[in-house]
């Protein structure tokens, strides 16, 4: 018995075709990806197979003005136009709490929502019951799969699930309900979720009974043979995965952003056991044509998304300092008020020894693209955000030893002078550089603000600790010639759109006045 | 569809002056850092300037310092150069071109200028 | 600083792997450019950063290198990549290497 499995990750609000680098589309003969192409491809394997399921393996949410203005609604609606089988949490399903994912998508959705090891208490446990289930058994042509979700338990420090949902280490909670999926005579047993492409292995080798892993949030891209794009493999698809118990199990993840559609074809035996698999994931570029329909529909909802960008999100009354000969030469305000909003959104009390897990933000003052000029009326727009924001990047969580971090900060002022974006701008960081010392030595006092404390002081940089930082995922992955992140980062989480986190903080705060407060000095 | 279209070019004496001119459209102009780059004919590429996104920063190539100034308007989406005491030399093709080297890297068709009694 | 690239020319057959290099005067990190060259035609953006590929390029291409010296391989010449290629680093001011120009042979 063959089965087609179909599966998406990490589509991340990108519901309209994007640019070969998931930004916003710009040359519309060579985009890719999107809802309305998606739906054509699906649809063609659909007619031409017969067992076919659709998948997706979580991160929906966040990532464009999309997700910000319908707040998960465009989730729903789409992915029940599009006939998905099934959809497993992934952590940024809970960044509007846990309001924000009843109300728009699990009471929305036509497909089952899963996950195994996010278990409820208290008040929400009866409120939340059955809209989200640890497994979902799928009747395909005479067969039928077992589906079981998971979700990382990391999420209490990458998201907003609040304190009524508690996350288990995967492994143990999955093993449980396959067993119980067994014991309902289910030999066909898919692990879609959302904890990255180490745990998926470590899924697919430890967990008795799953056939099949379809993971997330790692975005990761495995291809056999030459990859069509420009996304390099981790791997061949599917990656083999030999068991504790000797069976082969294969695992799959689709990349990121809608540009792909994973395609993977499993053959089983009458017993349910695996007999081979292969596939690769589809490019969706502009030689599949978008669905007309799902397009209409798409540019029905796309009026809303307009009619926000000129709405006010707060007022400043300062100058908001995004000038080039500011922030790539100095502290500047715009800077500290980013970085304020990016450990804003990542306040997370998760334990009493902490005032929070992340005190630490670090920002290129080239990504700073445009000043505000508080004599609009103090007016800020999504607009405004937009051009001091334009590249469509996120503000990501990163572990990092601080001998990274002071390589870093050399980095930052290696070239002093030139106007180049290298320069960083801070939060929870206090930093003084000497410019008369050589390149790679300029650095003369690192103070970083503490975490474990009850009181948040400023205390020396040590080089051995791991420290937690807030940072764009441009420079996550190395860019502005920070090699020595990519390089040495331990973890690396993707985080919420930018232009996101700017308007939350500013329709929080409502009025804003940032000043230059002596983060960055010269000796 | 992202545009850069240049115009302005032309024949002029020696001594003479010529502004040229970038239309942008497609993207979001004032966010980007735009360049002046220029090709002698059959010669190779000769970067002459750059200016920051919100015009606060320039620089030039020693060719041209003191003679050449870019500027920007980026209510109109346009990108300037004013050439001063034109050489036989600064004859070429001139290109203005987002930043260089970066993700979002394009480039106009040129525009000749000719320098020449 | 100062980009010299060499060869300055190159005579090479489709299918054939093809090497430029491009070698820094003094040390520029991976501030690294590479751009493709048609007769009457802007530049194309290939490579930044010394080895990453810009959207839309063909994965035959691939840059490497850090420091003073670069190079920019081409691993199976197709017809349409006989063109000028030029190097050009933004370690400071922009400066272009004088390019290599690749004909068939």
């Known amino acids: 018995w063959e089965l087609t499995i179909l599966h998406t990750n990490d589509v991340h609000s990108r519901l309209e075709q994007t640019s070969e680098d998931s930004s916003k589309c710009v040359n519309a003969s060579r985009c890719m990806g999107g809802v309305a192409r998606l739906f054509t491809k699906v649809q063609q394997i659909r007619r031409a197979e017969p067992n076919v399921l659709l998948l997706d393996a979580g991160d929906q949410y966040q990532g464009t003005i999309w997700f910000t203005v319908y707040k998960g609604a465009e989730v729903a609606h789409f992915m029940n136009a599009l006939r998905y089988d099934a959809m497993a949490l992934g952590n940024h399903e809970f960044d509007n709490g846990v309001e924000g994912l009843i109300e728009p998508l699990l009471k929305e959705a036509k497909f089952p929502i899963l996950s195994a090891n996010i278990k409820a208490k208290g008040p929400l446990a009866s409120q939340i019951s059955g809209l989200y289930l640890p497994y979902k058994v799928l009747p395909v042509g005479d067969e039928v799969v077992g589906i079981v979700g998971y979700t990382s338990k990391e999420t209490p420090f990458l998201s907003n699930p609040g304190t009524n949902l508690v996350f288990e280490d995967e492994i143990t909670a999955l093993q449980p309900e396959v067993d119980k999926l067994k014991t309902l005579n289910v030999n066909k047993i898919i692990a879609l979720g959302h904890s990255g492409f180490e745990m998926d292995k470590l899924i697919a080798q430890k967990v008795r009974g799953v056939d099949v892993v379809v993971g997330g949030h790692s975005n990761t891209f495995l291809y056999t043979g030459n990859p069509p794009s420009k996304e390099v493999p981790a791997g061949k698809y599917p990656f083999i995965v030999t068991s504790d118990d000797g069976r082969k199990v294969p695992v799959v993840q689709a990349y990121a952003f809608g540009k792909y559609l994973g395609y993977l074809k499993i053959e089983f035996d009458e017993r349910g056991n695996v007999i081979s698999s292969h596939g690769n994931p589809i490019l969706l570029n502009s030689s599949i044509p978008e669905d007309p329909s799902i397009k209409a529909d798409i540019n029905k909802w796309r009026i809303k998304l307009d009619n926000y960008s000129t709405q006010e999100l707060g007022k400043t009354i300062v100058y908001l300092d995004g000038s080039s000969q500011s922030c790539r030469f100095r502290e500047c305000n715009m800077g500290n008020l980013i970085c304020d909003a990016m450990i804003n959104n990542n306040l997370r009390h998760t334990d009493e020894m902490f005032w929070n897990h992340v005190s630490m933000c670090i920002l290129n003052g080239g990504g700073i693209r445009s000043p505000i000029d508080e004599r609009n009326n103090g007016t800020i727009t999504w607009e405004n955000l937009a051009a001091v924001l334009p590249f469509g990047g996120t503000f990501d969580l990163v572990q990092l030893k601080g001998s990274t971090l002071k390589k870093a900060f050399e980095h930052s002022v290696h070239r002093y002078g030139q106007s180049t974006g290298e320069f960083l701008q801070v939060g929870g960081i206090h930093v003084v550089y000497d410019l008369s010392r050589k390149p790679g030595d300029r650095v003369v006092k690192l103070d970083v603000l503490c975490t474990k404390c009850r009181v948040p002081s400023y205390d020396p940089l040590k080089m051995d600790e791991v420290y937690k930082v807030i940072l764009p995922n441009f420079l996550a992955n190395g860019g502005d010639g920070f090699q020595m992140i990519k390089d040495e980062l331990l973890r690396h989480d993707s985080g919420d759109q930018d232009i996101n986190v700017v308007s939350t903080y500013i329709s929080k705060m409502k009025v804003i006045y940032p000043a230059v407060e002596g983060r960055i000095k010269f000796s | 569809e992202v545009q850069l279209v240049e115009s302005g070019g032309g024949l002029v004496q020696p001594g003479g002056s010529l502004r040229l001119s970038c239309a942008a459209s497609g993207f979001t102009f004032s966010s980007y850092d735009m360049h002046w780059v220029r090709q002698a004919p059959g010669k190779g590429l000769e970067w002459v300037a750059v200016?920051?996104?919100?015009?606060?920063?320039?620089y030039y190539a020693d060719s041209v310092k003191g003679r050449f100034t870019i500027s920007r308007d980026n209510s109109k989406n346009a990108l300037y150069l004013q050439m001063n005491s034109l050489r036989a030399e600064d004859t070429a093709v001139y290109y203005c071109?987002?930043?260089?080297?970066?993700?979002?890297?394009?480039w106009g068709q040129g525009t000749l200028v000719t320098v020449s009694s | 600083i100062q980009m010299t690239q060499s060869p300055s020319s190159l005579s090479a057959s489709v299918g054939d792997r093809v090497t430029i290099t491009c070698r820094a005067s003094q040390g520029i990190s991976n501030y690294l450019a590479w751009y493709q060259q048609k007769p009457g035609k802007a530049p194309k953006l290939l490579i930044y950063a010394a080895s990453t590929l810009q959207s839309g390029v063909p994965s035959r291409f691939s840059g490497s290198g850090s420091g003073t010296d670069f190079t920019l391989t081409i691993s199976s010449l197709q017809p349409e990549d006989f063109a000028t290629y030029y190097c050009?680093?933004?370690?400071?001011?922009?400066?272009f290497g004088q390019g290599t120009r690749l004909e068939i042979k």
């Open positions: 200016m920051s996104y919100e015009g606060s920063n320039k």
């Open positions: 050009q680093q933004s370690y400071s001011t922009p400066h």
């Open positions: 071109a987002t930043e260089i080297a970066a993700k979002g890297d394009y």
